[in-house]
């Protein structure tokens, strides 16, 4: 291999340009991250298989050995060489696949040696004739365009034995005869041929690695040599199918070329992208320059590898030169593993498709160019549910979409690889990348389709990507009451006032004696004033910040273990509910209204008082009766002020905390659920008639879509984190004053099992009457949508008895910490509460997004109008009776996600001019302008009713 | 502190009627039902029933259904169990008790009120 | 109805000495229980609900067990002030129900 240096180096093609463009494409741009639109008209759509890895027959009808068929028994560890998915035999149910599929193109490969066993062309074996003459007619039958590669690296065994293979240049005219009969026989029915498929990895593995046949390795110079013959095959054969056969056939004719990708280190430096232009050249460049570029090797190649590698005369340049009638492009896994499959250069692989087929246009020229061959692989125990090869040609296909459309590269058809599981070469059968399923112990070798053969049917017939989810943007307004929020988690009181300067009456000088101390000034009394509620250095700040933000409402959460140390009434910390009271009454006069949480557990800090965290907190049902006394202490002191409450902030995600077993979570809920109830009835019947605000809990309310929606078992799970999720606590609320029955039922069935040895608590009559109806609206704390999958789970574990597993959709955007932006998802979580619970009132308490911006927070301020948007669209169009939207949150944590509006040290981030513009607009006014707020609308009689209150 | 004092000791005929009171302080009163408790001479407690404070709907056993009743006077923070057409097995003392919504048992109870019958 | 059955109606024990009350349910109460003491004409008085968790103000030599049917009162070192009668309680369903008592008496 060739020396790392880092001298600058000039390349014919302009492809290192491509990472010196912006590589911070806007993180909101969602047409970056995943682009909704279709392909060019007439798109070419196909997808492909090798004969090698699918024939099978492998001795059958006079087929001659291959190389392949010697290195599996010599080289290869493989149980059977009769696995495979025998298309030689099951050629019908190919068929029934591709049909399945909808596609416009088949590319498979003739295996030379099935037509001619010893490699010679003489007399074709009759029985391989006869089956590529009936797969060509029955797909020419079916309007499926064939796309024929006549070498995908099973060489005559013959050939290898005789000559060597392809180090020697005798098979360069031996390869020509064989595609000359290939034309002649079959370039009637054939448009589009290939004449070798991945050259690269023939030269690189089957000589240099040993990986792949023949298995020889450690000869560099071989690895050149055979690169070279392999092109000047292909050359003789463009210049034969051009000169003999394109006048009348009309056909096309390329070669594959494979490649990896790679992306710098650094983005800026230059080192780093020369590096990366030197690996992408050493294996695309090696064959692509000769025949897409200046008929030469890269000019990098050249210099360092002097010694092994074979020099083009100046007639063979102009020989290779242009030999490729469009540019066939592989980008696969055979391309990226083993790791020595490419010099990385100390760079850092990347499967970015839309990046490569960029560099291909700028380095070549933008050419035309197929994707003979993309696709991922799955492990081989994966069956018909392959979720992650989804999301991966999803990836792919929508990276292909956005070169086409954002970039102009021109990417004229798709092939996806593959169409069946079959021999993955030194992988053997240990891995598959069928869009069909093959149980290869079967008899039939039935093709059951996977998950991403629904998935590329679906493309395929849409040409493209449809939004289905999401409906258009909105214009319109909130009604005028509408809160407009932001939430903050515990607000921890200041103890004393900060602020001393008021209440001492002494006079003092500075540094008098010149020890920088303060002397008091004897005789001197200065008049003092009462504490005012400004001198709390906190609540200025809140002011101040709650102030640039123009909200109308502010959630915070009350410290339990402050204002009660004990736990109970014993001991009231005065001075927090003095804090507090300053927190309400400094806002109300910025006509900033409170929503107090009474209780805001953490992670890493239940909140408790002390004592009753020893006792045993939420595990002990008399915890109830302590937050019972506390809820009434704050209804007390603050009830007057506040008219929106929350007892518990996510209940639901109290199994973070509690988690030893199933069971403790379980009680843990159950006497949060009771104590919440408690409080309800306390507030209801005691401070309600008084005070007339209105009371709820709110619950973590992410939505759940089927990780794959292919698989009846991934919608179950979906509707099973709901359950498990909200409804768990929505249910007895809202409905029918126990637990779901679908949650119930499935722990208990899970017990049965022996799966688990969980027990959902059962409520008893009194707590069933206590807790039905306990909650005054819907409080949801709605952040994302999570892809979720069925996976059976052991063990007593509330995360273990849901059985659900979590997917990552690679194509949504998404935030430093994963969270997907994905707002309808919150629309279809406020439909599904009103369906499930009914018409009540909802307010969003808790919306938000971490961003790692400081100041311009571009994906928070994409979040809020996108959720905000959805938000609206469930008012206008659902009817739904949303009545606050709080964003979150005030401020960040240090070293935590960063979710803030402002920093840990207050600094303002600009997603706070955007929240200013929603709330001042209350919405999304259309031009000329909704009705405002502040003016009267319609009722001349509201005047006097505001008098009279 | 929470107290719930109950009427005097009543000696009473059969056939006639006793109401026992049971007045509360301490407490919002309207906020926690009120239970009746029966202790015959020497037996073990029997719960008879209990009353809404805050919709006057009250609930009773089979045993004490008909001339049994249960009443509130909540602007006095005042439940009331009244007894008709006394029989000789109706003596025993009467318990009120505040409850915690049916959750935790009986935390406070009052002192208790004899009930005599007899010819 | 549930019927709250309390094994043994009199227990003569000495002072000092570790007591163990039992009540049992005929169904399952899932810890919906309350141990009550009284003592001669006073009214009962709540010592623990839920099974196990003692009621403020009640010494720490009482104690709850117990789940399903099962359940068990205990005071590990009788006192004086602890002589009385003993009732547990279901508050699981309608109707409430109580068990006999089970009187402690000095021996």
């Known amino acids: 291999d060739y020396k790392d240096d880092d001298d600058k180096l000039d390349f014919p093609g302009d492809g290192r340009a491509v990472w010196s463009q912006n590589p911070n494409l806007s993180p909101v741009n969602e047409s970056q991250l995943f682009l909704y639109d279709t392909f060019p008209k007439n798109f070419f759509w196909g997808v492909g298989t090798g004969a090698f890895q699918v024939e099978g027959s492998w001795k059958k009808d006079g087929k001659g050995l291959s190389v392949w068929d010697h290195f599996i028994a010599t080289h290869l560890n493989v149980s059977s060489r009769d696995g495979s998915s025998d298309s030689y035999i099951f050629l019908e149910k190919d068929l029934s696949a591709l049909d399945f599929l909808g596609v416009s193109f088949y590319q498979f490969s003739i295996s030379w040696p099935r037509l001619f066993p010893d490699g010679t062309v003489a007399v074709a074996n009759a029985k391989g004739l006869q089956y590529y003459n009936r797969l060509l007619d029955s797909l020419l039958l079916r309007n499926i365009e064939p796309v024929v590669t006549l070498y995908h690296w099973d060489l005559p065994w013959a050939l290898q034995e005789k000559y060597g293979g392809w180090k020697n240049e005798t098979l360069i005219d031996l390869f020509n005869d064989y595609a000359t009969y290939c034309f002649q026989t079959f370039g009637d029915r054939v448009k589009y041929w290939i004449t070798i498929h991945n050259p690269y990895l023939v030269a690189w593995h089957g000589y240099g690695t040993g990986l792949h046949a023949p298995g020889e390795k450690g000869n560099v110079a071989a690895v050149y040599t055979v690169g070279h013959n392999l092109l000047k095959a292909h050359s003789k054969v463009w210049h034969n199918y051009n000169r003999n056969f394109r006048p009348h056939q009309k056909g096309w004719l390329s070669i594959t070329l494979g490649s990896h990708w790679i992306e710098p280190n650094r983005a800026e430096s230059i080192v780093d992208i020369l590096k990366c232009q030197q690996s992408m050249v050493s294996v695309l460049g090696w064959f692509a320059n000769p025949i897409h570029g200046d008929g030469d090797y890269p000019e990098v190649m050249t210099k360092k590898l002097l010694s092994v590698l074979p020099a083009f005369s100046e007639a063979e340049k102009n020989e290779v030169r242009g030999t490729a009638d469009f540019f066939a492009f592989s980008f696969g896994p055979n391309n990226f593993k083993p790791l020595n499959t490419m010099a990385k250069m100390g760079q850092n692989v990347s499967l970015n498709l839309r990046q490569v087929l960029n560099w291909i246009k700028l380095e070549y020229g933008n050419p035309r160019i197929l994707i003979a061959e993309n696709g991922w692989f799955t492990d081989s125990y994966v069956q018909t549910e392959d979720t992650t090869a989804i999301y991966m040609m999803k990836n792919f296909l929508n990276q292909v979409l956005q070169a086409i459309r954002l970039d102009g590269v021109r990417v004229f058809g798709y092939t996806a690889w593959s169409l069946l599981d079959g021999f993955e070469w030194q992988d053997a059968y240990n891995t598959r990348r069928g869009l069909f399923y093959v149980d290869f112990n079967s008899e039939q070798r039935e093709r059951r389709p996977k998950s991403s053969a629904h998935y590329y049917k679906q493309v395929i017939g849409e040409n493209g990507f449809t939004l289905r989810e999401a409906t258009p943007d909105l214009q319109g307004q909130f009604p005028c009451d509408f809160s407009w929020g932001v939430t903050e988690s515990v607000l921890k009181p200041e103890s004393v006032a900060s602020s001393p300067q008021f209440s001492d009456p002494h006079l003092y000088v500075w540094n008098a004696t010149g020890n920088r101390m303060l002397h008091r000034v004897e005789g001197v009394r200065l008049k003092t004033r009462p504490a005012q509620c400004t001198d709390f250095i906190t609540i200025k700040k809140q002011l101040e910040m709650l102030a640039r933000m123009k909200v109308t409402h502010f959630r915070f959460a009350l410290d339990w273990a402050s204002v009660l140390p004990t736990g109970n009434l014993s001991e009231v910390n005065r001075q927090a509910l003095r804090y507090y009271r300053c927190v309400v009454t400094e806002g109300l006069k910025l006509n900033i209204s409170p929503m107090v949480t009474l209780y805001y557990p953490t992670h890493a800090h239940l909140g408790l008082p002390a004592p009753l965290l020893h006792s045993g907190g939420w595990l002990d049902p008399s915890t109830a009766k302590a937050f019972r006394d506390y809820a009434g202490l704050c209804f007390r002191e603050l009830g007057d002020l506040v008219k929106l409450w929350i007892t518990i902030n996510e209940p639901n995600r109290l199994s973070d905390v509690y988690n030893r077993t199933s069971n403790d979570t379980y009680q843990a809920a159950h006497n949060l659920l009771i104590a919440h109830a408690i409080v309800w009835h306390l507030y209801d019947r005691q401070y309600r008639p008084s005070q007339r605000g209105a009371l709820s809990l709110s619950l973590h309310s992410d939505w759940a879509e089927p990780a794959n929606p292919y698989v009846a078992s991934h919608w179950q799970a979906a509707e099973r984190f709901l359950q498990f999720e909200i409804a768990w606590f929505a249910e007895p609320l809202f409905k029918t004053g126990d637990y779901p029955v679908a949650m119930r039922e499935y722990i208990a069935s899970k017990t049965r099992r022996g799966l688990s040895s969980s027990v959902l608590p059962r409520f008893s009559d009194a707590e069933r009457r206590l807790v039905k109806g306990a909650a005054d609206f819907y409080a949801l704390n709605h952040f994302t949508t999570r892809f979720v999958m069925h996976e059976q789970q052991n063990g007593s574990r509330y995360d273990s008895d849901r059985d659900v597993q979590f997917l990552q959709d690679i194509t949504r955007l998404a935030s430093p910490s994963r969270l997907a932006v994905m707002p309808w998802g919150e629309g279809k979580l406020l439909r599904w509460m009103r369906n499930n619970y009914g018409d009540l009132d909802v307010y969003i308490t808790a919306n938000g997004i971490d961003d790692q911006a400081l100041q311009n927070d571009q994906l928070r301020q994409y979040y809020l109008e996108k959720y905000v948007q959805e938000a609206l669209k469930a008012y206008l169009i659902d009817k739904i009776k949303i009545k606050g939207y709080y964003a979150f949150k005030l401020t960040e944590e240090k070293s935590k996600p960063r979710f803030g509006f402002f920093t840990s040290d207050f600094k303002a981030k600009s997603s706070i001019q955007f929240y200013n513009k929603l709330i001042t607009s209350n919405g999304f006014p259309s031009e000329n302008g909704g009705p405002r707020c502040n003016q009267t609308q319609g009722n001349p009689e509201c005047t006097v009713c505001l008098l009279l209150l | 502190q929470i107290q719930l004092v109950q009427s005097g000791p009543e000696l009473k005929k059969p056939g006639e009627t006793a109401k026992i009171s049971c007045k509360a302080s301490?407490?919002?009163?309207?906020?926690?039902?009120m239970n009746w408790v029966k202790q015959a001479p020497g037996k073990d407690l029997k719960w008879m029933g209990w009353?809404?404070?805050?919709?006057?709907?009250?609930t009773y056993t089979d045993d004490f259904k008909g001339r049994f009743v249960f009443s509130l006077e909540t602007s006095a923070s005042t439940a009331y169990l009244q007894i008709n057409n006394l029989k000789n097995e109706d003596m025993a003392t009467y318990f009120c008790?505040?409850?915690?919504?049916?959750?935790?048992?009986?935390?406070?109870w009052g002192h208790g009120t004899l009930v005599t019958v007899s010819a | 109805d549930i019927q709250m059955t309390q094994s043994s109606s009199s227990f003569s024990v000495s002072l000092g000495d570790r007591v163990t009350i039992t009540c049992k349910a005929s169904?399952?109460?899932?810890?919906?229980l309350a141990w009550y003491q009284q003592k001669p004409g006073s009214a009962p008085r709540l010592l623990i609900s839920a099974a196990t968790s003692l009621e403020t103000g009640v010494p720490s030599r009482f104690s709850g067990s117990g789940s399903g049917k099962d359940y068990t009162l205990s005071i590990t070192s009788l006192q004086t002030e602890d002589v009385a009668t003993y009732y547990c309680?279901?508050?699981?369903?309608?109707?409430?129900?109580f068990g006999a008592g089970t009187k402690l008496e000095i021996k």
């Open positions: 008790a505040r409850e915690e919504y049916g959750l935790f048992g009986f935390p406070y």
């Open positions: 169904e399952d109460i899932y810890n919906r």
């Open positions: 301490g407490y919002a009163f309207s906020n926690y039902g």
């Open positions: 309680q279901q508050y699981w369903s309608n109707p409430l129900t």
């Open positions: 009353i809404d404070t805050d919709t006057g709907e009250a």
